[in-house]
């Protein structure tokens, strides 16, 4: 699916993981995910 591509989040910086459609920056400790990011390597909405 999608041809040859890296099977990991290829985003600048750490703490990105695949959530839904995109690799998103994860939530800080003590926070939870309200909504995933809406662009590749974007920021999740955390509470």
């Amino acid at each position: 699916q999608g041809g040859t591509r890296s099977p990991r989040c290829d985003c600048a910086g750490d703490f990105h993981k695949k959530i839904g459609l995109f690799c998103c920056r994860g939530c800080p400790a003590g926070h939870y995910l309200k909504a995933p990011c809406t662009e590749p390597c974007g920021n999740s909405t955390c509470l």
């Epitope: 699916q1 591509r5 290829d10 959530i19 839904g20 995933p36 809406t38 390597c41």
Partner: antibody, heavy 123, light 111 residues
Framework: EVQLVESGGGLVEPGGSLKLSCAAS????????MSWVRQSPEKRLEWVAE????????YYPDIVTGRFTISRDDAKNTLFLEMSSLRSEDTAIYYC????????????????WGQGTSVTVSS | DIVLTQSPASLAVSLGQRATISCRAS??????????MQWYQQKPGQPPKLLIY???NVESGVPARFSGRGSGPDFSLNIHPVEEDDIAMYFC?????????FGGGTKLEIK
């Protein structure tokens, strides 16, 4: 051969509800993100919903948020779109679309489209 | 939302000549060196069909007379030489950010 067959369209009064279905075959449905895209009578294309593979996160534009719900049944290779509080501007042909991912971090193109099902909202 | 403006709205080209359709985004659709822009063809009575992805990659099975180019916010689709079978509507679409958006379409006709 990839096939996407929509059903469930029809005539509905403003404020009414409708549930569209899309039967998928010819590919491993569970591994693909899927979308619904509609085309107005004026031929304008508008993306209205998407669901990711695996974790089934859902995404909508503001214009349908709270009114439309996309879901999938991977066991039955079927995609759904539940529409409520329908308005005249929701009148369109609704296409079921497969989303091919070209980058793991999230780049998608709509590489296969069904023939569409027509929805008319009118009193 | 990223707005895509296509031009011209309609285009009449002689058989064998070149057709060029433009698409301008309200902001860049680049992501780490990839232009997240697609082109689709829609013939009368049919659903859209993917022609070009990532601005310049031709989808499998699409004739070589179709090509795409561009970067940042400015993109174009070229058809050369134009054939009768190319009579259709053409749409650009961005995948840089949700909501995915489409251009208003360009109708290609034969002169």
């Amino acid at each position: 051969e990839v096939q996407l067959v929509e059903s469930g369209g029809g005539l509905v009064e403003p404020g009414g509800s409708l549930k569209l279905s899309c039967a998928a075959s010819g590919f491993t449905f569970s591994t693909y993100a899927m979308s619904w895209v509609r085309q107005s009578p004026e031929k304008r294309l508008e993306w209205v919903a998407e669901i990711s593979s695996g974790d089934s996160y859902t995404y909508y534009p503001d214009i349908v948020t709270g009114r439309f719900t996309i879901s999938r049944d991977d066991a039955k290779n079927t995609l759904f779109l539940e529409m409520s509080s329908l308005r005249s501007e929701d009148t369109a042909i609704y296409y079921c679309v497969r989303d091919q991912d070209y980058r793991y971090d999230g780049y998608y193109a709509m590489d296969h489209w069904g023939q569409g099902t027509s929805v008319t909202v009118s009193s | 939302d990223i707005v895509l403006t296509q031009s011209p709205a309609s285009l009449a080209v002689s058989l064998g000549q070149r057709a060029t359709i433009s698409c301008r985004a309200s902001e860049s659709v680049e992501h780490y060196g990839t232009s997240l822009m697609q082109w689709y063809q829609q013939k009368p009575g049919q659903p859209p069909k993917l022609l070009i992805y990532a601005a310049s990659n031709v989808e499998s099975g699409v004739p070589a007379r179709f090509s795409g180019r561009g970067s940042g916010p400015d993109f174009s689709l070229n058809i050369h030489p134009v054939e009768e079978d190319d009579i259709a509507m053409y749409f650009c679409q961005q995948s840089r950010r949700i909501p995915w958006t489409f251009g208003g379409g360009t109708k290609l006709e034969i002169k």
